[in-house]
């Protein structure tokens, strides 16, 4: 039997409280063949901002067609966790699942979606919904990439030299300058998967009085500027 899996698209909305919610579900164009079975096996990578809520969806198959619904969750450095619902007996079962923030959205017989409340760096991993029907399994897989917004600082540390830092971002931010200077960039990797990027630039040309540091990141972009003083100036700091 075919083992379909389908591409997804990120939709972001604001809930009533401050926490943003991402739903990795969509109506999509499907690849169909004999008997209208979907044959595409696609695992999709999706970025999700840290501290938001995320909802992951199964393929659109009615409960009346199902035997078992299983979510398989593989997180780095942990045993594979499975959450299963058996329709015939109306029972749910969990194996090796320790993170209480990863749950069914509601009763599986009403909604097969999986939710992650307050996404953390530790939720980086692979999530797969497996829908077992009498004629085979339908799959939908997600490679979840947790995004962390870096803290951006810009300061002058020597005569006509500025330092721009994007601290503890995930993935690493990209730093560029206007105007371009004589720059050196270093990256520092932390054990939790975040990266600090430090760019130090020097401008010999004396008609350059103001410089701008532009930080590009998947969570958003930020620009800071500073006046080049003959002596070290004030420190500037911002979140993306």
């Amino acid at each position: 039997a075919a083992q379909p899996n389908n591409s997804l698209m990120l939709q972001t909305s604001k809930e009533n409280h401050a926490l943003a919610s991402s739903s990795l579900c969509m109506d999509e164009k499907q690849i169909t063949q004999n008997y209208s079975k979907v044959l595409a096996e696609v695992n999709t990578s999706w970025p999700v901002k840290m501290a938001t809520n995320a909802v992951l969806c199964c393929p659109p198959i009615a409960l009346r067609n199902l035997i078992i619904i299983t979510w398989e969750i593989i997180l780095r450095g942990q045993p594979s966790c499975t959450k299963a619902y058996k329709k015939e007996t109306n029972e749910t079962k969990e194996t090796n699942c320790t993170d209480e923030r990863i749950t069914w959205v509601s009763r599986p017989d009403q909604n097969s979606d999986l939710q992650i409340r307050t996404v953390a760096i530790t939720h980086d991993g692979y999530y797969r919904c497996i829908m077992v029907t009498p004629d085979g399994n339908f799959h939908r897989g997600y490679h979840l990439q947790v995004l962390v917004t870096p803290e951006v600082t810009l300061f002058q540390n020597r005569n006509r030299t500025a330092v721009c830092k994007a601290v503890a971002g995930k993935p690493a931010a990209h730093i560029s300058w206007i105007p371009e200077g004589d720059c050196a960039t270093k990256q520092e990797y932390w054990s939790n998967g975040t990266v600090t990027v430090k760019s130090t630039c020097h401008w010999e040309v004396h008609n350059v009085s103001t410089v701008t540091c532009h930080v590009s990141h998947l969570t958003g972009n930020k620009s800071l500027y500073i006046e080049l003083l003959p002596v070290p100036g004030a420190k500037k700091s911002a979140k993306l």
Epitope: P4, C25, S36, P60
Partner: antibody
Framework: QVQLVQSGAEVKKPGASVKVSCKAS????????MHWVRQAPGQGLEWMGY????????NYNEKFKGRVTMTRDTSTSTVYMELSSLRSEDTAVYYC????????????WGQGTLVTVSS | DIVLTQSPASLAVSPGQRATITCRAS??????????MHWYQQKPGQPPKLLIY???NLESGVPARFSGSGSGTDFTLTINPVEANDTANYYC????????FGQGTKVEIK
């Protein structure tokens, strides 16, 4: 290919019962839910209910509960729809339709069976 | 039960023009990012034929002149450009809960 072949036209008297058959071929019969829909002359489509041949589950439209029975025979890959206590307004073409998994859409239909209820 | 209301009841269109049929549900037929709304074409003496599933997906073998859109409670079937053999009745159907059909739209080609 997937095919649904229904039984022939029927003429029934009011109060009688009718049993329409729908024979499936070209796929694993027990794997797919089968729906029944009817269409009165010059009218729209009306869902009657479904049977899941895999586990014999049935679900009927409230309007037909108590009068309709859907059954299946796995040895002949056939589903049946029986409607009792017939009245003239039950005169219609009755269709079976197979539900495809993805999106619960109905991709394959029988050719239809005309049931006429007349005294 | 979810009630589906189609409009208009009938429609006359010239070949090459656009035909638009709408279907409104009494409550949302969308869940988990999917809209469980489908569109069928029925010609006289024939069973219905699936055109569009899950609101916007074209069934295999159906011409790209047919398209569907919408989510939640409001959906549209568009035929563009219309051809002479598109004369038929068109029905929306939902499978969010127990299945129901719209009352149908009769499309005639001028």
């Amino acid at each position: 290919q997937v095919q649904l072949v229904q039984s022939g036209a029927e003429v029934k008297k009011p109060g009688a019962s009718v049993k329409v058959s729908c024979k499936a071929s070209g796929y694993t019969f027990t794997s797919y839910v089968m729906h029944w829909v009817r269409q009165a002359p010059g009218q729209g489509l009306e869902w009657m209910g479904y049977i899941n041949p895999y586990n014999d589950d049935t679900n009927y439209n409230e309007k037909f509960k108590g009068r309709v029975t859907m059954t299946r025979d796995t040895s002949t890959s056939t589903v049946y729809m029986e409607l009792s206590s017939l009245r003239s307004e039950d005169t219609a073409v009755y269709y079976c339709a197979r539900e495809d998994y993805y999106g619960s859409r109905w991709g394959t239909w029988g050719q239809g069976t005309l049931v006429t209820v007349s005294s | 039960d979810i009630v589906l209301t189609q409009s208009p009841a009938s429609l006359a269109v010239s070949p090459g023009q656009r035909a638009t049929i709408t279907c409104r549900a009494s409550k949302s037929v969308s869940t988990s990012g999917y809209s469980y709304m489908h569109w069928y074409q029925q010609k006289p003496g024939q069973p219905p034929k699936l055109l569009i599933y899950l609101a916007s997906n074209l069934e295999s073998g159906v011409p790209a002149r047919f398209s569907g859109s919408g989510s939640g409670t409001d959906f549209t079937l568009t035929i563009n450009p219309v051809e002479a053999n598109d004369t038929a009745n068109y029905y929306c159907q939902h499978s969010r809960e127990l299945d129901t059909f719209g009352q149908g739209t009769k499309v005639e080609i001028k």
